[in-house]
């Protein structure tokens, strides 16, 4: 859960407020209480954001972009609170806001710098392109431009491709990494310095498993303690890659503790789930079950991917029948 906005105090009656795209924020302003209160909020010294005087709002000449988006804390004005409640901020709202407060005693002017950040939850994807395997860290909407770092077996990788598309509001970023033939673990970190928010994606390849037809296989999936926080909402998805695309076998939502199973031979141990162990069993294996199995544990702050390769071989009986 993130705060409405956070303030950084800087000198000369100026504060910095950091907000999130589409969320509500408060632009702070206080004054020495007095009668005959007049409050004018302006943007970049030009656009009228909000005016209050003679005991009520006067929004006749309010700039249209602020219509139905601003209000004051009316019960607090007499106590010296001229702060502005600002709904659904956009990146176009970034800039300097000036609050003019006049009373019977004095006039004061406060400046507030609004910075807006975007950080839609990133994802880590595992893709096969022909014979190549790729890990892709991507974020659909981010602002300002984030810092993306990759590690292989906890060692930073200098090679870092970044595919960037900019829209009016924010950046969309893909950072692919070719991991063909590698058994290493990989970690991708995306950091939004403005919002002081970091997301981490971690990919681990488990040793291949060889099973006979009709047997069952147990595939492990346990979160790494460094990232995992059980009181934070997360989702666990098990999927199987078939002809280059993944099909979902089952998923679990921590918020509702719901488990949805799409494959009748798939089973999850409820007791293990309660201990944050999302290992699964697949019963009565057949030859078409050979392939890659992916466990994805995701929250707002991380994605943990675990890959298992399963080889299902014909049993002796089946072989002798042929």
């Amino acid at each position: 859960i993130f705060p409405l906005a956070f303030f950084i105090y800087v000198p000369m009656n100026e504060q910095i407020v950091i907000g999130r795209l589409d969320e509500d924020i408060i632009l702070p302003s206080s004054f020495e209480r007095g009668s005959e209160v007049v409050i004018h909020w302006k943007y970049q010294d030009s656009y009228k954001v909000h005016s209050y005087y003679k005991g009520s709002d006067h929004l006749e000449s309010q700039d249209p972009r602020y219509a139905n988006r601003t209000s004051l804390f009316y019960n607090e004005i007499q106590n010296g609170n001229a702060s502005l409640f600002f709904r659904r901020v956009s990146l176009l709202d970034e800039g300097i806001y000036t609050c003019y407060v006049g009373t019977a005693i004095q006039v004061i002017t406060n400046k507030v710098v609004l910075k807006v950040g975007v950080f839609l939850t990133p994802v880590m994807k595992y893709e096969k392109r022909n014979t190549n395997s790729f890990l892709i860290c991507s974020v659909l909407s981010v602002y300002p431009r984030p810092i993306i770092t990759w590690k292989m077996d906890n060692t930073p990788i200098s090679e870092n491709n970044m595919e960037e598309t900019g829209s009016l509001d924010s950046f969309s970023i893909n950072s692919p990494l070719n991991i063909t033939g590698s058994n290493s673990s990989y970690e991708c970190t995306i950091e939004n310095s403005l919002l002081k928010q970091t997301w981490t994606g971690r990919w681990t390849m488990k040793d291949g498993l060889h099973k006979m037809q009709s047997e069952h296989v147990s595939l492990s999936c346990q979160p790494v303690n460094d990232y995992f926080s059980p009181n934070q909402d997360f989702k666990v998805t098990w999927s199987r890659m078939k002809s280059g695309t993944f099909s979902v076998l089952a998923y679990y939502l921590s918020s509702s503790q719901n488990t949805i199973i799409n494959e009748s031979r798939f089973s999850w141990n409820k007791e293990l789930i309660n201990q944050s162990d999302f290992s699964m069993n697949l019963m009565d294996l057949n030859l078409s079950d050979s392939g890659e199995y992916l466990c994805n544990i995701s929250s707002d702050e991380y994605t943990l991917l675990t890959i298992h390769t399963v080889h299902v071989e014909p049993s002796q009986e089946t072989a002798s029948h042929n």
Epitope: S35, E36, V38, H40, K42, D45, S46, S51, Y53, K54, G55, H58, S61, Y100, G102, T103, A104, V107, T109
Partner: antibody, heavy 121, light 107 residues
């Protein structure tokens, strides 16, 4: 202390123009709205116009709208009233007066001494 | 425009008297009313704002009351220095308008 000093008054013929000035001191000029108020000889007070603290909002009495223009220069602490198409009924002492704050309140805390404008043929 | 009507137009009173001037608005102006004192040959001076708030530096013998359309200015004990014309002014809405004035004379 707060001081407002009007200048520019005089005798002018009907239909002609005149420009009044008001020099302000003793307060932060750019923080306050300033009004012009006039008083015909032996008559009552009549509000003429206001300009808000930063100069973007200007309002006029019906009797002068379209003929008079209020303006200010915050860097020079001066207020002006450009009066065009003057009429005999514009004859009055013109006062500049400071608003309580931005100009939005609409009453007059400090007044200048006034400057007389006489419109006569 | 909102019309402001003062009564009486002229008032003669003795030093020490309690004096009341009335101002009536043609429509409700809440409490957005000011009172001014103007001495002969001088600029007006603010006495009362928001119908009843005494401006800083104004003697406490001056007081204001009322809201809506009916307002009064009271001088509790008239002093020789109070010889002047008194004006009410509404600032509820543009255009701001004044009463025609009440001339106060000392007997």
């Amino acid at each position: 202390q707060v001081q407002l000093v009007e200048s520019g008054g005089g005798v002018v013929q009907p239909g002609r123009s005149l420009r009044l000035s008001c020099a302000a001191s003793g307060f932060t000029f750019s923080d306050y709205g300033i009004h012009w108020v006039r008083q015909a000889p032996g008559k009552g007070l009549e509000w003429v116009a206001v300009i808000w603290y930063e100069g973007s909002d200007k309002y006029y009495a019906d009797s002068v709208r379209g003929r008079f223009t209020i303006s200010r220069d915050n860097s020079k602490n001066t207020l002006s009233l450009q009066m065009n198409s003057l009429r005999v009924e514009d004859t009055a002492v013109y006062y500049c007066a400071r608003d309580r704050s931005s100009g939005a309140m609409g009453y007059f805390v400090y007044w200048g001494q006034g400057t007389l404008v006489t419109v006569s043929s | 425009d909102i019309q402001m009507t003062q009564s009486p137009s002229t008032l003669s009173a003795s030093v020490g008297d309690r004096v009341t001037i009335t101002c009536r608005a043609s429509q409700s102006i809440s409490s957005w009313l000011a009172w001014y004192q103007q001495k002969p040959g001088k600029a007006p001076k603010l006495l009362i704002y928001k119908a009843s708030s005494l401006e800083s530096g104004v003697p406490s013998r001056f007081s204001g009351s009322g809201s809506g359309t009916e307002f009064t200015l009271t001088i509790s004990s008239l002093q020789p220095d109070d010889l002047a014309t008194y004006y009410c002014q509404q600032y509820n809405s543009y255009s701001y308008t004044f009463g025609q004035g009440t001339k106060l004379e000392i007997k």
